[in-house]
């Protein structure tokens, strides 16, 4: 018996297509992804073959002004209309906190959501029951398939999912829920989840009954063969992982953005062993053309978003200085303020010893593209943030070591006075700098502000001690230079959308005043 | 190298029954789709209708339906073409076309080299 | 069944002139629209797909172009072998239509 699993992953509100580096669509001709190329391409699968799942590992949400208008509205609406099979829930589905999962996806979805890992407590319990659930078993054809979901573990640090959530072990959790499936007598089961490529393919070693593992969270792209894009292999699709039990188990992902559709075919024998596994991630590429009905949704939707992006998000008072005469040479309020912003958007009270788990942001200044001029009624707008920050990216949670970071900062100011872009502006950092020693020796002083503390205070920075650092996906992938990052990097958790968490920041502070404040210092 | 085997011309009395091949080689049978495509003496294309070999679905024009049936056998990679009674108007050339589904070459981009069928009394 | 109005009927150009044929749909197929050629004893043979992507193999002289419900195609000098009938072909919805077929001559 054969089944076909096509499966997407970290779309991340690219319900538009998009250029080939997922930003903004500029020119169509070479555009790829977006919701009305999909649905072409998985009712043609459909149409082609018997039993087609379509499947999505986690984070639909989260990543363009798609979320920041919809808010998820727009997730179950198009999710809805590609008649998706299941859903895994992934960390950013609890960005706008528990409420904003409940009423706009998990009440309006016509397709089960799943995560066996996720256990409500206290009053959340009984409002939530029965809204996601650990496991679904779906008919196929003549046949049935067990759907096993899991998330993060790390969610409370990475999003809002509140108090009453418990975000349990995934192998501890998801193994008594295959178990309860076999009894079931359903013996065809797949893990849908969003923990990453290094829990999935642990998952298919160690999780007894297991099939086939599709996952997310780590953007991981696999292909057999010569990619067709510009994305480079982690390793074969699909990954095969031999299990303890002397299984071989298909893991796969379709790397992120709506760019790619998994597609893998499975061969099961009657007792749902799997025979024999093969496929590749489809490149949505502008060849395959966009379904003109879902199109017309889109723009129908488009509308609204046109409408937002002219009005007031907030005010300033000062003039925010983004220039790059200012942001690549010296602190600039700008970065100040965009710093500050990443912080205060990963605020999560983990414990009583911890007054928050990361205080310490690092920005490149040339990522700061324009200023924003307080004459204009000191208004702004999303339009005005996306002149600053006009890339799409997102900003993204770290664990570094000491040496790592230190190594930052003297590639920081290694050609300085060059107006180039790796000049960093900071957060929960204090530096300073002697322009007049050697490359690679000019940091003096690098004080960071503890975690560890009832009162934040600055301490200075341990060469050996892991740090968590907020920084755009651009540094933490390497861009301006900052290899060490992406060589040296413990962990590395994909964020928010840059311009949201910017916005989301000056709505909430309503009116902003941001200072230059002695954060960089030259001795 | 992809090709498309098609089987000879024919001729054949109206009411008779028919059944032309396709032979598909160099690529993976039940990975394609498979279209026929008829044409009239001095006329232009028209699509009949498809299967996919891998699922053994098949569509009809709905002008074609009932009038032909689609069918293959994956075991030898050949689709077939045929008719329960044929009538003079069937008289044209008959081409398999091969379909990438999978792909993104929205189009046949493998033909076979057409099947001639003459039904005259 | 969408409508696959092809134009002209036939046309006939000077070696190393420009051709165009023009293909209308009768409701939007978005890009699904693919171009072949045929000549004498011979099936048709893909050149466009997906309404501008050229097929591997076909010389670059020709291309196409359009989306929605109007499309062409373009031979940008013409060569005495590309005479032949020309038919547009839409893959958006069964039954897959193809235009009438556009005969191309050399003036």
């Known amino acids: 018996w054969e089944l076909t699993i096509l499966h997407t992953n970290d779309v991340h509100s690219r319900l538009e297509q998009t250029s080939e580096d997922s930003s903004k669509c500029v020119n169509a001709s070479r555009c790829m992804g977006g919701v009305a190329r999909l649905f072409t391409k998985v009712q043609q699968i459909r149409r082609a073959e018997p039993n087609v799942l379509l499947l999505d590992a986690g984070d639909q949400y989260q990543g363009t002004i798609w979320f920041t208008v919809y808010k998820g509205a727009e997730v179950a609406h198009f999710m809805n209309a590609l008649r998706y099979d299941a859903m895994a829930l992934g960390n950013h589905e609890f960005d706008n906190g528990v409420e904003g999962l409940i009423e706009p996806l998990l009440k309006e979805a016509k397709f089960p959501i799943l995560s066996a890992n996720i256990k409500a407590k206290g009053p959340l319990a009984s409002q939530i029951s029965g809204l996601y659930l650990p496991y679904k078993v779906l008919p196929v054809g003549d046949e049935v398939v067990g759907i096993v979901g899991y998330t993060s573990k790390e969610t409370p640090f990475l999003s809002n999912p509140g108090t009453n959530l418990v975000f349990e072990d995934e192998i501890t959790a998801l193994q008594p829920e295959v178990d309860k499936l076999k009894t079931l007598n359903v013996n065809k089961i797949i893990a849908l989840g969003h923990s990453g490529f290094e829990t999935d393919k642990l998952i298919a070693q160690k999780v007894r009954g297991v099939d086939v593992v599709v996952g997310g969270h780590s953007n991981t792209f696999l292909y057999t063969g010569n990619p067709p894009s510009k994305e480079v292999p982690a390793g074969k699709y699909p990954f095969i992982v031999t299990s303890d039990d002397g299984r071989k188990v298909p893991v796969v992902q379709a790397y992120a953005f709506g760019k790619y559709l998994g597609y893998l075919k499975i061969e099961f024998d009657e007792r749902g062993n799997v025979i024999s596994s093969h496929g590749n991630p489809i490149l949505l590429n502008s060849s395959i053309p966009e379904d003109p009905s879902i199109k017309a949704d889109i723009n129908k939707w488009r509308i609204k978003l046109d409408n937002y992006s002219t009005q007031e998000l907030g005010k300033t008072i000062v003039y925010l200085d983004g220039s790059s005469q200012s942001c690549r040479f010296r602190e600039c309020n700008m970065g100040n303020l965009i710093c500050d912003a990443m912080i205060n958007n990963n605020l999560r009270h983990a414990d009583e010893m911890f007054w928050n788990h990361v205080s310490m942001c690092i920005l490149n200044g040339g990522g700061i593209r324009s200023p924003i001029d307080e004459r204009n009624n000191g208004t702004i707008t999303w339009e005005n943030l996306a002149a600053v920050l006009p890339f799409g990216g997102t900003f993204d949670l770290v664990q570094l070591k000491g040496s790592t970071l230190k190594k930052a900062f003297e590639h920081s100011v290694h050609r300085y006075g060059q107006s180039t872009g790796e000049f960093l502006q900071v957060g929960g950092i204090h530096v300073v700098y002697d322009l007049s020693r050697k490359p690679g020796d000019r940091v003096v002083k690098l004080d960071v502000l503890c975690t560890k503390c009832r009162v934040p205070s600055y301490d200075p920075l341990k060469m050996d001690e892991i740090y968590k650092v907020i920084l755009p996906n651009f540094l933490a992938n390497g861009g301006d230079g900052f290899q060490m990052i992406k060589d040296e990097l413990l962990r590395h958790d994909s964020g928010d959308q840059d311009i949201n968490v910017v916005s989301t920041y000056i709505s909430k502070m309503k009116v902003i005043y941001p200072a230059v404040e002695g954060r960089i210092k030259f001795s | 190298e992809v090709q498309l085997v098609q089987s000879g011309a024919e001729v054949k009395k109206p009411g008779e029954s028919l059944k032309i091949s396709c032979k598909g080689s160099?690529?993976?049978?039940?990975?394609?789709?498979l279209s026929w495509v008829r044409q009239m003496p001095g006329k232009g294309l028209e699509w009949m209708g498809e299967?996919?070999?891998?699922?053994?679905?098949?569509y009809y024009n709905e002008k074609f339906k009932g009038q032909v049936t689609i069918s293959a056998d994956k075991s030898i990679s050949t689709a077939y073409l045929q008719w329960s009674s044929l009538k003079a108007s069937d008289t044209a050339m008959y081409y398999c076309?091969?379909?990438?589904?999978?792909?993104?070459?929205?189009?046949?981009?493998?033909w076979g080299a057409g099947t001639t069928v003459t039904v005259s009394s | 069944d969408i409508v696959m109005t092809q134009s002209p009927d036939s046309l006939a150009v000077s070696l190393g002139e420009r051709a165009t044929i023009n293909c209308k749909a009768s409701?939007?197929?978005?890009?699904?629209v693919a171009w072949y050629q045929q000549k004498p004893g011979q099936p048709p043979k893909l050149l466009i797909y997906?309404?501008?992507y050229r097929y591997s193999g076909v010389p670059d002289r020709f291309s196409g172009s359009g989306s929605g419900t109007d499309f062409t195609l373009t031979i940008s000098s013409l060569q005495a072998e590309d005479v032949a009938v020309y038919y547009c072909?839409?893959?958006?919805?069964?039954?897959?239509?193809f235009g009438g077929g556009t005969k191309l001559e050399i003036k």
């Open positions: 997906s309404a501008s």
């Open positions: 299967i996919y070999p891998g699922s053994g679905n098949t």
């Open positions: 160099g690529y993976t049978f039940t990975s394609y789709g």
């Open positions: 072909q839409q893959h958006y919805n069964t039954p897959y239509t």
């Open positions: 409701q939007d197929v978005s890009t699904a």
């Open positions: 076309a091969r379909y990438d589904y999978l792909g993104s070459s929205y189009g046949f981009d493998y």
